[in-house]
């Protein structure tokens, strides 16, 4: 019986060419972590396994840092980074637990004037 | 290229004791979690037991709980499944697989061990 | 325990023919589905994982649809090296399960 749930930092903004850090919280279980997925869409960007520690994609090693925690931070900021991010949490017995983030880079000026990202 | 390549089965009586290994090789063994995975003789597959890549999880199927005994050894680059009070419904062909590194299915196989529990 | 049913149980078609298999989990798995390939007296081998994404060297005619309960493998053309015996497989939770696979026969 899955009784866990996964909090998110929900939907984010940031401005284009700085970083960001998506974080996820697993609460309300006894589960054990096995490995946390974070992915885009349907890419891979970084798994952090209980046993391995971390490991960041290839394609992804110049703008992907481990951390703080079990959270990722996104760094050198593009547009086309605006988009779904998903924390997949592997539990045992569980199961799967999946958190999602949206999150939205904005052009430097318009981030300067405040304009925050809202899904009505 | 990736290899699996299981041996130590054979025929024994019920109440028995076997050990299965599995050999890797094609790979960084310690960096993927491994399963033991079973069909027996004209039957669909069912999953035994997992382990991690460094043992910290150990998983196994309820049908063998307390039975079967799954470890690793990194340094020998071998999987290992012992297997006790062995019954007649434990025969089967036993295979090796190692885990995606994503934890999202089996991508490798061994060509599996034949095991065979009977009097 | 999660039970994955298949249907059919097996089928008959020609080389060419577009073929589907259906997997039914017991309770919503989300994208979590495998599929594997399996011919007689060899082991296993993985063509689909997490729903929908091809494993690598695997041929595009294999295809994977469906999430929550309700899974599609689909074989766009036939070829003779396709005969073989199907399962699907659950990966979310543990005990993982399988399906009771779906034998694909030369019609």
């Known amino acids: 019986m899955m009784t866990g749930t996964i909090e998110t930092t929900g939907n984010i903004s940031a401005e284009k060419g700085g970083s960001i850090i998506l974080q996820c919280h697993l609460s309300s279980t006894t589960a054990q972590v096995t490995q946390v997925n974070w992915e885009q869409q349907d890419q891979l960007l970084a798994i952090c396994n209980a046993d391995l520690g971390w490991h960041i994609s290839p394609s992804f090693k110049d703008r992907v840092a481990p951390g703080p925690g079990l959270g990722l931070t996104l760094q050198s900021l593009t547009v086309n980074d605006t988009g779904e991010y998903f924390c997949i949490y592997h539990t045992y017995p569980d199961g799967t637990y999946t958190g999602r983030i949206f999150l939205e880079v904005l052009e430097s000026s318009v981030a300067e004037h405040g304009a925050r990202f809202q899904i009505p | 290229e990736v290899q699996l390549v299981e041996s130590g089965g054979g025929l024994v009586q019920p109440g028995g004791s076997l050990r299965l290994s599995c050999a890797a090789s094609?790979?960084?063994?310690?960096?993927?979690?491994m399963h033991w995975v079973r069909q027996a003789p004209g039957k669909g597959l069912e999953w035994v037991a997992f382990?991690?890549?460094?043992?910290?999880?150990?998983y196994y199927a309820d049908t063998v709980k307390g039975r079967f005994t799954i470890s690793r050894d990194n340094a020998k680059n071998s999987l290992y499944l012992q297997m006790n009070s062995l019954r007649a419904e434990d025969t089967a062909v036993y295979y090796c697989?190692?885990?995606?590194?994503?934890?999202?299915?089996?991508?490798?196989w061994g060509q599996g061990t034949m095991v065979t529990v009977s009097s | 325990d999660i039970q994955m049913t298949q249907s059919p149980s097996s089928l008959s078609a020609s080389v060419g023919d577009r073929v589907t298999i259906t997997c039914r989990a017991s309770?919503?798995?989300?994208?979590?589905l495998a599929w594997y390939q399996q011919k007689p007296g060899k082991a296993p081998k993985l063509l689909i994982y997490?729903?929908?994404t091809l494993q690598s060297g695997v041929p595009s005619r294999f295809s994977g649809s469906g999430s929550g309960t309700d899974f599609t493998l689909t074989i766009s053309s036939l070829q003779p090296e396709d005969f073989a015996t199907y399962y699907c497989?659950?990966?979310?939770?543990?005990?993982?399960?399988f399906g009771g696979g779906t034998k694909v026969e030369i019609k």
């Open positions: 497989q659950q990966h979310n939770e543990y005990p993982w399960t």
């Open positions: 094609g790979f960084t063994f310690s960096n993927f979690g």
């Open positions: 309770k919503s798995i989300s994208k979590y």
């Open positions: 997490s729903g929908s």
């Open positions: 697989a190692r885990m995606r590194l994503d934890y999202y299915a089996m991508d490798y």
């Open positions: 382990i991690s890549s460094g043992s910290s999880s150990i």
